[in-house]
Interface confidence: medium
């Protein structure tokens, strides 16, 4: 029987309020709004939590029975939908101890994980996973790339009770590997031994100067001469223009600086490769992956353009379960979710389309109208002139 | 700790220009332009990114150009055929991010009244 210590889905309305707690650590925290966003796959299911407001930092979070991971698996997992498109925000969760004060949660409590994805510009589109290892936050030394796009993802985190641990993205594996290796908790295993030091004799070139190789007699010459053809102009005035210089050209002769032929070094040995020895300040920790206390789950974020939506939470200790889990939410809505936007895509193409046309249209009609009035105004300006023709003469017989 | 000093504003008649300005110190992952209109929520109006990438509200965009001056580490709003609902506030966002961190910083603001 899996073990569920959190699960979180939003499907009774209102009822979010009483069981996530706003932090007032700073006035102007983001609101989260329950919504199923502007496409989805079913309204009601795909309900979750929505960042409201742009360029704000966010700090909610839920509380759940305390509980250690000691011995046993410990799977984290959330959808994260950033349906606007996101430029820069996280879409992470943070555990914490039980002894958080929630209404203080802010960018510096101390955690026990933070596990998700991270978008900031071209430079960083990553899920952080962060352990808190006697105090310090301690990165992946893996880059795990992160979905961009405006559709939801599930997100999941495995550690074991054997320092392993797995990241997945939509239920399939991204990441995995031993706690050891991929985040630097412990001191290195081996290390350069002290005491060794590179032979004065150890000769670490491969090639060398042909110590019988010298420099021809010829090789030296300027590398610029007095061009020989040029002459100078016969009106050239040594009293006004100084003495005439021929102009200077690159010497073809010129051979640049010598240097002698490279030929293999007999005393050659390769590089020197500096001994290791054990660690002494190393000794394994066979409980890295260990807390002895789990009691919230926080979204603590800064987002720069809000619509991120969170749902569809887990906390269990069942691999099986949770993928079982992320199935029926997730995996039901996705396909849907993605017709509906698809749908408004188009709708919205055809709407720009007819847009486009009536604009065109409406441009021609007022080109039209004004070729008409320019052509009315040719009219009138035409019949003025036959007139003051007709008028002309007129005049003259009465002069006469 | 980052220091933010905008400055720029004015009043403009509609269809004009006016260029802000926005000087920081301290090493920044993204620069960003907000505004805020009386009585409204503080909206997004363009950033730009340490790689160079930029975003720009569907309100502003075509209108309003944001770059950035390296050597004098000041971003620059350049705002063209201004119009009165541009009216607001504008605000000058510095972020500072670090090992899943985040710190904003925020100018004083200027403010840009399009008027006729």
């Known amino acids: 029987e899996p073990a569920v210590y959190f699960k979180e889905q939003f499907l009774d309305g209102d009822g979010w309020t009483s069981r996530w707690i706003e932090s007032k650590h700073k006035s102007d925290f983001g609101k989260f709004v329950l919504s199923s966003g502007k496409f989805y796959g079913d309204e009601e299911k795909d309900k979750g939590l929505q960042t409201s407001q742009d360029a704000r930092f966010y700090a909610l979070s839920a509380s759940f029975e305390p509980f250690s991971n000691k011995g046993q698996t410990l799977v984290v997992q959330f959808t994260v939908k950033h349906e606007q498109n996101i430029d820069c925000g996280g879409g992470y969760v943070k555990l914490f101890p039980n002894s958080l004060d929630q209404t203080d949660m802010h960018g510096d409590s101390e955690y026990n994980i933070m596990f998700g994805p991270d978008i900031c510009g071209p430079g960083t589109k990553k899920v952080h996973v962060i352990f808190n290892y006697k105090g310090k936050n301690v990165l992946i030394n893996k880059d795990i790339r992160c979905k961009d796009d405006e559709f939801t993802h599930l997100y999941t985190l495995i550690v074991r009770p054997d320092n392993t641990y797995e990241v997945k993205i939509d239920n399939s594996q991204v990441e995995s590997g031993s706690l050891e290796d991929d985040w630097d908790f412990l001191p290195p295993k081996k290390i350069k031994d002290p005491d060794a030091s590179k032979p004065e004799d150890w000769d670490e070139r491969a090639k060398i100067d042909d110590p019988t190789d010298s420099k021809p007699e010829d090789w030296d010459k300027p590398e610029h001469i007095p061009d020989p053809d040029a002459k100078k102009p016969e009106d050239w005035d040594e009293e006004m223009d100084g003495e005439w210089e021929p102009p200077v050209i690159q010497n073809p002769e010129y051979k640049g600086e010598w240097k002698p032929r490279q030929i293999d070094n007999p005393d050659y040995k390769g590089t020197w490769i500096h001994p290791e020895i054990d660690n002494p300040e190393y000794s394994p920790d066979p409980s890295i992956y260990a807390y002895d206390n789990f009691g919230v789950l926080g979204l603590d974020l800064w987002q720069v353009k809000s619509g991120t939506i969170f749902d569809n939470f887990l906390i269990t200790n069942d691999e099986a379960y949770a993928e079982e889990f992320g199935n029926e939410t997730w995996g039901v809505t996705k396909a849907a979710e993605k017709q509906m936007k698809d749908k408004q895509d188009e709708e919205q193409r055809l709407k720009e389309e007819e847009e486009d046309k009536k604009r065109k249209e409406e441009e021609e009609a007022e080109d039209k109208e004004d070729d008409e009035d320019k052509d009315e105004d040719e009219e009138d300006e035409e019949d003025k002139e036959e007139d003051e023709e007709e008028d002309v003469p007129g005049q003259a017989k009465d002069e006469l | 700790q980052v220091q933010l000093q905008e400055s720029g504003g004015g009043l403009v008649q509609p269809g004009g220009s006016l260029r802000l300005s926005c000087t920081a110190s301290?090493?920044?992952?993204?620069f960003g332009w907000y505004r805020q209109a009386p009585g409204k929520q503080r909206e997004f109006v363009a950033n730009?990114?340490?790689?160079?990438?930029?975003r720009y509200s569907d309100s502003v965009k075509g209108r309003f150009t944001i770059s950035k001056d390296n050597a004098k580490n000041t971003v620059y709003l350049q705002m063209n055929i201004l119009k009165p609902e541009d009216t607001a506030v504008y605000y000058c966002?510095?972020?500072?991010?670090?090992?899943?961190?985040?710190?904003?910083?925020w100018g004083q603001g200027t403010q840009v009244t399009v008027s006729s």
């Open positions: 730009m990114y340490v790689g160079g990438s930029i």
């Open positions: 301290g090493s920044i992952a993204a």
């Open positions: 966002n510095a972020l500072v991010r670090f090992e899943g961190r985040n710190d904003d910083y």
